[in-house]
Every structure is written in structure tokens, then in C-alpha cells.
């Protein structure tokens, strides 16, 4: 099958500090040197794209400086942390992989792990 | 609104060159791949080419391998495709389209026309 | 490459009838990466379908894709005027990207 599937977790719950973490892994169908990942939100029938990075096999993931995601490379798996999550960001992100070189080109998108994020209650106000 | 708009078909001799153009608008164009395809008279789709992001990972059909070449200018949200050695066979309206978030070929341009004919 | 097959070539309906196309994939294809198209005389294609099953934005609920492995069909509910037209399928799950040969829908 000239396919590649790819893996993530179903849902994760981000941190009081509004970062979420989760494992992409595709199955690679070729041998790539050179590997794009995407990170897509689908909210309703909208999508938009959170963050992308390209590396090549061996090195580290480098996302752009403002990106809001950082991550690690590890063969065919990819661990990505998103952060400055809120409550309003709550939502289904699907991890989009893409061996870029050499050819053929392939193309894998997960099923979307749901991040639920939590707005920490504020502290209330101590008198002493 | 998002859109794509071809110029640059026209006329040509067997053997010359034609560059078609694709102005995007209306979207962040380093985010996507850009495609050509092509459609002969009456015939069906044919997909020509591919650019990247970047702009350094290229595809080609073996159709026209070694004779065209796409590129993209980012900072005209402009995509190319340069066409040398033309044959009678490459004589078809040549699309633009994005390959959009999930893959499929979301926005297509309207099309321009490129006869190569003696 | 992955070759394309639509049949049938041409199918002649009436308004009002329920058109089932067919698109057959020469090896297994992801449902993921299976799109069709709709084509008029003069126009570019549109996206209908994309994941095999997924509608793209704008598109009529007659609308609807189905299959899996190497065997994909695109039905049309209820033809409705506008939808007299060519259907294209697509696999973009690899290089190089392919379509079928096309299915024409005419009336009747």
C-alpha cells in the first residue's frame, strides 16, 4: 500500500500552564532525509495551521522563533509540545507528516488528538 | 477572498519557450504546495508539478521532466512555470492549485491556454 | 504510480436520480488521500470530496464519497441541473499525483 500512516494519542489534557505534549509517529514507507511536520487545529470545519517544521533525518526539529511549538526527533517519531494553550484553544490537533527527499513524496495525516485545556482558577486575594 | 490567477499562455512554435505565471491572494502562500496541472482539448487532468514551502523541494511528471521547471516568489505570492523545448503534445489549458491542508487540490485558478503549434 | 480507473465513461440520467460513480486505484490507496472533482464546460475544476469521504466547504449535502482500499465511489444523491458535469477523482497520498481518466455526467 503506498500509503503512510501516522499515530498520535487520542486526547491529552494540557498543564495549569497551558502546555500540551503528545508523540507523533509515522510509518515511514520510504527512506526520508528530509521530513516535514505540520501541526493542524480543526475547530468545526475551519482549519488552520498551529506551527511546521522541517529537518532532516538525525537532526532536531527547528520550528520558527515565535512558533508556539517545540519538539524532538527520534527516528520515525516525533514528540511535539505546544504551549501557551487556553481555554479557547481547546480542540482536535491533527499531526500532518510529509517525507519531502528524496523522491517519491509521501503524505500522512493523523486522526487528531483532542487537547483539552483548562484555565487555572485565579488565586483569590490573601489578606495577612 | 483566497484566489490564484494564470497569465502567460499563448501561442508558440514547436521547440521555444513560454513562462506561465500565478498570482495568489488571500492566503499565507509559503504554507502551501503549489501545483500545476494541465488539460489537453477534450481531454482529462494531468497532474505537471509540484513546489514546496520553501521552494527547494520540486516534482516534476515525467512528461515534461528536464524541460520545465516551477519555482515560486514568496515575496510575490507569485508561481512560475518555466516551459522550454515545447512540444505539440504540451498544448493544453495549465492550471494553478493549491494543495491545501489535508493534500487535495482545494484552489484552482482559471486556467491558461498554451498552444504549441507550427 | 498509482493509475486511476472511472467507469462508467459517460452516464446518462435525469434530474432527480441518484448517480453513483466509481473510481478503481491499480493498488491500495488510504481512504486519507482520496479526493474528487467537479468539472464544467470552460471551468477549472472544484474540490468535492477530499479523504475520500470528507465534503469540502460549500458543498451540497447530495454530495457523498465512500470506500476504501482500492475501490471509491462518489454518489450523487439527487442530480440537481448544475450537476451535469465531469467527476474526477484524485489520489495525493504520493508522488507523482494522479487522476482518473473522468466520468461524464449528461442528461438524459
Known amino acids: 500500500c503506498k500509503a503512510m500512516h501516522v499515530a498520535q494519542p487520542a486526547v491529552v489534557l494540557a498543564s495549569s500552564r497551558g502546555i500540551a505534549s503528545f508523540v507523533c509517529e509515522y510509518a515511514s514507507p520510504g527512506k526520508a532525509t528530509e521530513v516535514r511536520v505540520t501541526v493542524l487545529r480543526q475547530a468545526d470545519s475551519q482549519v488552520t495551521e498551529v506551527c511546521a517544521a522541517t529537518y532532516m533525518m538525525g537532526n532536531e526539529l527547528t520550528f520558527l522563533d515565535d512558533s508556539i511549538c517545540t519538539g524532538t526527533s527520534s527516528g520515525n517519531q516525533v514528540n511535539l509540545t505546544i504551549q501557551g494553550l487556553r481555554a479557547m484553544d481547546t480542540g482536535l490537533y491533527i499531526c500532518k507528516v510529509e517525507l519531502m527527499y528524496p523522491p517519491p513524496y509521501y503524505l500522512g495525516i493523523g486522526n487528531g488528538t483532542q487537547i483539552y485545556v483548562i484555565d487555572p482558577e485565579p488565586c483569590p486575594d490573601s489578606d495577612f | 477572498q483566497v484566489q490564484l490567477v494564470e497569465s502567460g499562455g499563448g501561442v508558440v512554435q514547436p521547440g521555444r519557450s513560454l513562462r506561465l505565471s500565478c498570482a495568489a491572494s488571500g492566503f499565507t502562500f509559503s504554507s502551501f504546495g503549489m501545483h500545476w496541472v494541465r488539460q489537453a482539448p477534450g481531454k482529462g487532468l494531468e497532474w505537471v508539478a509540484v513546489?514546496?514551502?520553501?521552494?527547494?523541494?520540486?516534482y516534476y511528471a515525467d512528461s515534461v521532466k528536464g524541460r520545465f521547471t516551477i519555482s515560486r516568489d514568496i515575496s510575490k505570492s507569485t508561481l512560475y512555470l518555466q516551459m522550454n523545448s515545447l512540444r505539440v503534445e504540451d498544448t493544453a489549458i495549465y492550471y494553478c492549485a493549491r494543495g491545501g491542508y489535508y493534500g487535495a487540490f482545494d484552489i484552482w485558478g482559471q486556467g491558461t491556454m498554451v498552444t504549441v503549434s507550427s | 504510480e498509482i493509475v486511476l480507473t472511472q467507469s462508467p465513461g459517460t452516464l446518462s440520467l435525469s434530474p432527480g436520480e441518484r448517480a453513483t460513480l466509481s473510481c478503481r486505484a491499480s493498488?491500495?490507496?488510504?481512504?486519507?488521500?482520496l479526493a474528487w472533482y467537479q468539472q464544467k464546460p470552460g471551468q477549472a475544476p472544484r474540490l468535492l470530496i477530499y479523504g475520500a469521504s470528507s465534503r469540502a466547504t460549500g458543498i451540497p449535502d447530495r454530495f457523498s464519497g465512500s470506500g476504501s482500499g482500492t475501490d471509491f465511489t462518489l454518489t450523487i444523491s439527487r442530480l440537481e441541473p448544475e450537476d451535469f458535469a465531469v467527476y474526477y477523482c484524485?489520489?495525493?497520498?504520493?508522488?507523482?499525483?494522479?487522476f482518473g481518466q473522468g466520468t461524464k455526467v449528461e442528461i438524459k
Open positions: 493498488q491500495s490507496v488510504s481512504s486519507s488521500y
Open positions: 484524485q489520489q495525493y497520498g504520493s508522488s507523482p499525483w494522479t
Open positions: 513546489t514546496w514551502y520553501n521552494g527547494r523541494n520540486k
